[in-house]
């Protein structure tokens, strides 16, 4: 019967007694940077070309005995998970292996860099179809390794890496912390984060998604027909590399940004028990388990968005945090969040010719996060319209005044330390969907976009008194592009998007002694692209 | 994911203007930085990746590596160029004493230097 991990990543329509999704990734080459591998194992024979690349450190210890099967164990298993005949994800994918880890599973940053350079040179000498690079390894944060990954990604290569097995913030490790790399955490058959001895899967904002990574059956280097069960974020990353190979084989022109958005979109949502993660990491860690798309084609019509959290700003008075989208994504909205509630909002601003999302800490605050909503919007022309603080009782408002521009997000930023001490009523304008409204002492920023067929609407959900959390979701066929809170007073900790739901967090009324007039409203901006839908229908 | 350093340790080694008239001073106002792994047991001192500024050509990388070797030799230090990078990042991998870091950071075209460190199968 089908192993649990293959069943987990398979949409119901493909489930039979066998795992045989439509295209096995035959147009894609997957590079594996790992240990040596037993390339003639029955599960992978003919699928893996062992390159002559080898850059590994000496094994530790004077009495180390090099046993071939042990040297090959990690890499052979991963090659099997990616493309194995019977237990692999992308059965049609061809692989190339580079040896950067020694018989003890240890390598160096420099050896990995030289390996990545080897791949780039191979790509230049003999351009083939789409390339996926699997990096089932981790070291401490490395500026140079992250930079090399960035360069390779910008050359059109999809890099997939293990989040790390240290039960720690993945941002402290490389290449897991490289923004251009798809970073994968591990979950088990119960959709729980994987525990590995006293440690376990890494987590946090640098993880893109999770995938099966416990008790994964794959090729064993003990014999040519043997299988073994292994666990770790390497196994999880191998699943995503296989899924990526299949997606790219079906749609070879997909960019890295498009692939990442699809991986997120087709993942199983909200199935991971977040209680396993440290409390301060729960909001930052994506609750996503990778899965194959239900159909290999026809996803192009959707407006894809994802949420990108910044690093923590730190506690100083003027501290700021910046969240950035990938080069070919559009920043459609910007929000902020602070656990202490002390923040001075957020704003969208240009940096190096691209919009970024900047959040501002407040005096006495423990720090803030900036949260960017990053979307794929072809032929988009977006700009930010700002209204300075109105100082009048009606509050500050700003709208999209250019012809054909629609509102995709609202941000507000204030200089006063505590808006909560200034409590004028905020009047809600009705029938003006292209308008952002905020506190009279805040400057308001509207993200206004023009794109073929783009239409957006505002959805609100308010509750009379703060109860920790208010949510509002976009309905089927619409994508959440903007998420903000009204009125933005001191008991609002911030707003952020989780998949297609806008979440506004506030301090519990019982702890703040607030009055019921301070209603908290979650405001979602939901968009869709008629143009993308039409283009997709024409293709079909 | 963000490209900020987090807990990553960064040491900016000051340039002493009187030292090494031989070295071309880096462009005004840019100080090359030195980075090393925050996790001490994973550090591999003695091997360094010297990363050069983005548009540096291979020939300049090779010249910079040779210059480092020459200046190190003048001070009685042996160095070994293990690899010259080009294609992804301009730079070179060098085996040398940590005593030479200050000298290396003053070389022309140097953006930053990172001490090598271990990576592990996950």
């Amino acid at each position: 019967s089908i192993p649990w991990n293959l069943e987990r990543i398979t949409p119901p329509r493909y489930r039979a007694d066998e795992y045989q999704p439509p295209d096995g990734g035959s147009l894609v080459e997957v590079y594996l940077l790992d240990t040596s591998i037993q390339s003639d194992h029955r599960e992978i024979e003919g699928r893996v070309m062992v390159t002559d690349f080898e850059n590994v450190p000496e094994e530790d210890g004077t009495r180390f005995h090099r046993q071939a099967s042990k040297c090959d164990s990690h890499g052979t298993h991963l090659a099997g998970v990616v493309s194995g005949r019977d237990a692999g994800v992308a059965k049609g994918a061809s692989m190339r292996s580079l040896r950067v880890l020694n018989c003890q599973g240890k390598g160096t940053v420099s050896g990995t860099l030289i390996g990545l350079e080897f791949i780039r040179k191979s790509q230049l000498v003999q351009p083939v179809g789409p390339l996926v690079v699997l990096l089932p390894l981790a070291g401490g944060y490395s500026r140079v390794l992250n930079a090399a990954c960035q360069r390779l990604a910008r050359a059109g290569v999809v890099l997939v890496t293990a989040a790390g097995n240290f039960r720690d913030d993945a941002c402290l490790y490389s290449p897991a912390s490289a923004p251009e790399v798809i970073t994968v955490g591990a979950t088990n058959a119960q959709d729980q984060p994987v525990t590995l001895g006293t440690l376990g899967t890494n987590f946090g904002r640098c993880v893109d998604l999770f995938a099966p990574g416990e008790d994964i059956i794959g090729a064993s280097s003990d014999c040519s027909t043997c299988f073994v069960s292994q666990s770790g974020t390497s196994q999880a990353a191998a699943h995503v590399a296989g899924i990526a190979a299949m997606m790219l084989s079906a749609e070879p022109e997909l960019t890295l940004a498009e692939l990442r958005q699809r991986l997120i979109h087709f993942s199983a949502k909200d199935v991971i028990n977040e209680a396993w993660f440290p409390e301060d990491q729960r909001v930052l860690t994506p609750n996503l388990v990778a899965a194959l798309p239900p159909s290999t084609h026809g996803a192009g019509w959707q407006l894809f968005c994802r949420t990108v959290w910044s690093a923590h700003s730190g506690p100083t008075r003027m501290a700021t945090a910046i969240a950035r989208c990938a080069p070919d994504e559009e920043l459609l909205s910007c929000s902020s969040f602070s656990r202490s509630g002390k923040r001075r909002g957020e704003r969208m601003e240009a940096q190096g010719g691209k919009l970024v999302c900047r959040a501002h800490n407040a005096f006495g605050g423990e720090g803030v996060y900036a949260i960017a909503r990053c979307c794929l919007l072809p032929q988009a022309n977006c700009s930010v319209h700002t209204a300075p603080p109105a100082e009048a009782s009606m509050g500050t408002r700003v709208h999209c005044h250019q012809q054909g521009h629609v509102l995709t997000g609202c941000s507000s930023h204030w200089e006063v330390e505590d808006l909560g001490t200034h409590k004028p009523p905020v009047l809600r304008p009705r029938g003006q969907p292209n308008q952002c409204v905020g506190h009279r002492e805040a400057s308001i920023h509207a993200s206004c976009c023009h794109a073929p067929g783009l239409e957006c609407k505002v959805k609100e959900h308010g509750i009379p008194a703060p109860q920790g959390q208010v949510t509002v979701a976009c309905e089927e066929g619409w994508t959440l592009t903007g998420c903000s809170a009204l009125p933005g007073t001191s008991h609002v900790l911030g707003a952020y998007a989780v998949d297609n739901t806008c979440v506004v967090r506030s301090r519990d009324v019982s702890t703040t002694g607030s009055t019921s007039e301070e209603a908290v409203t979650a405001v979602a901006i939901c968009c869709r692209s008629r143009h993308l839908a039409q283009a997709s229908q024409e293709l079909q | 994911q963000e490209d900020e350093d987090g807990d990553y340790e960064e040491l900016v080694l000051a340039l002493r203007s009187e030292e090494d008239g031989l070295a071309e001073a880096p462009e005004h106002g840019t100080t090359a930085t030195f980075h090393r792994c925050a996790k001490d047991p994973w550090r591999l001192p003695g091997t360094y990746v010297v990363v050069l500024k983005e548009e540096t050509h291979l020939s300049q990388s090779e010249r910079t590596a040779r210059r480092l070797q020459a200046q190190a030799a003048r001070r009685g230090y042996l160095t070994k160029i293990l690899h010259v990078f080009h294609g992804l990042l301009p730079g070179f991998l060098v085996k040398m004493s940590g005593d030479l870091l200050e000298l290396a950071l003053k070389l022309p075209h140097v953006d930053y230097i990172e001490e090598d460190s271990s990576v592990f199968a996950q």
Epitope: E18, Q20, Q38, S39, D40, R42, E45, G46, V48, M49, V50, A68, R85, D86, K91, C223, S224, T225 | -
Partner: antibody, heavy 115, light 109 residues
Framework: QIQLVQSGAEVKKPGASVKVSCKAS????????ISWVRQAPGQGLEWMGW????????NYAQKVQGSVTMTTDTSTSTVYMELRSLRSDDTAVYYC????????WGQGTTVTVSS | QSALTQPASVSGSPGQSITISCTGT?????????VSWYQQYPGKPPKLKIY???NRPSGVSNRFSGSKSGNTASLTISGLQAEDEADYFC?????????FGGGTKLTVL
Amino acid sequence: QIQLVQSGAEVKKPGASVKVSCKASGYPLTSYGISWVRQAPGQGLEWMGWISAYNGNTNYAQKVQGSVTMTTDTSTSTVYMELRSLRSDDTAVYYCARGYGMDVWGQGTTVTVSS
Amino acid sequence: QSALTQPASVSGSPGQSITISCTGTSSDVGGYNSVSWYQQYPGKPPKLKIYEVSNRPSGVSNRFSGSKSGNTASLTISGLQAEDEADYFCSSYTSTSMVFGGGTKLTVL
């Protein structure tokens, strides 16, 4: 092109041994092992075993375990199959084939065991 | 006694379609995605026609197709031609080895 070239026909007496060779070319040798298959006159195919060109590991069919030895010489890209204590029912055409997938076959070597 | 069971012979007229079955157990055919089909002419080595249940090697006519249901695999040849007359063998992985079927003689009438 991809080729497996086998040694010539052999006639052996019962109790003797035979060693058949198979030279591989045209593909990355370590990506595949070599399977050995035999076919008695007018009969079906019987898988005898497999040898790794990567590390020399072997996997023999239970029926021939103890009487067969497969070896490899990486310097000449040649694999050998030795069958000991031959009996008349070992008379067959012996084929080498690429890997477990057996997608490429040698031309066959006829081994006749007769007193 | 072969591990996989095939009909001893099948026949068909030119242009017709024929199907050859190959029945095993859950430990071989039913348990793996690696059923292959070989064509063999007298005095020649076998030639791979189908691998991994339903894949055709390059150069093999699309008249040849393979499928599997449970513990039985099938080879279908459509638009039968005179040159298809040959012996056909199936093979499958087992946990540690390989097994063949006894072979089916295809006669084109």
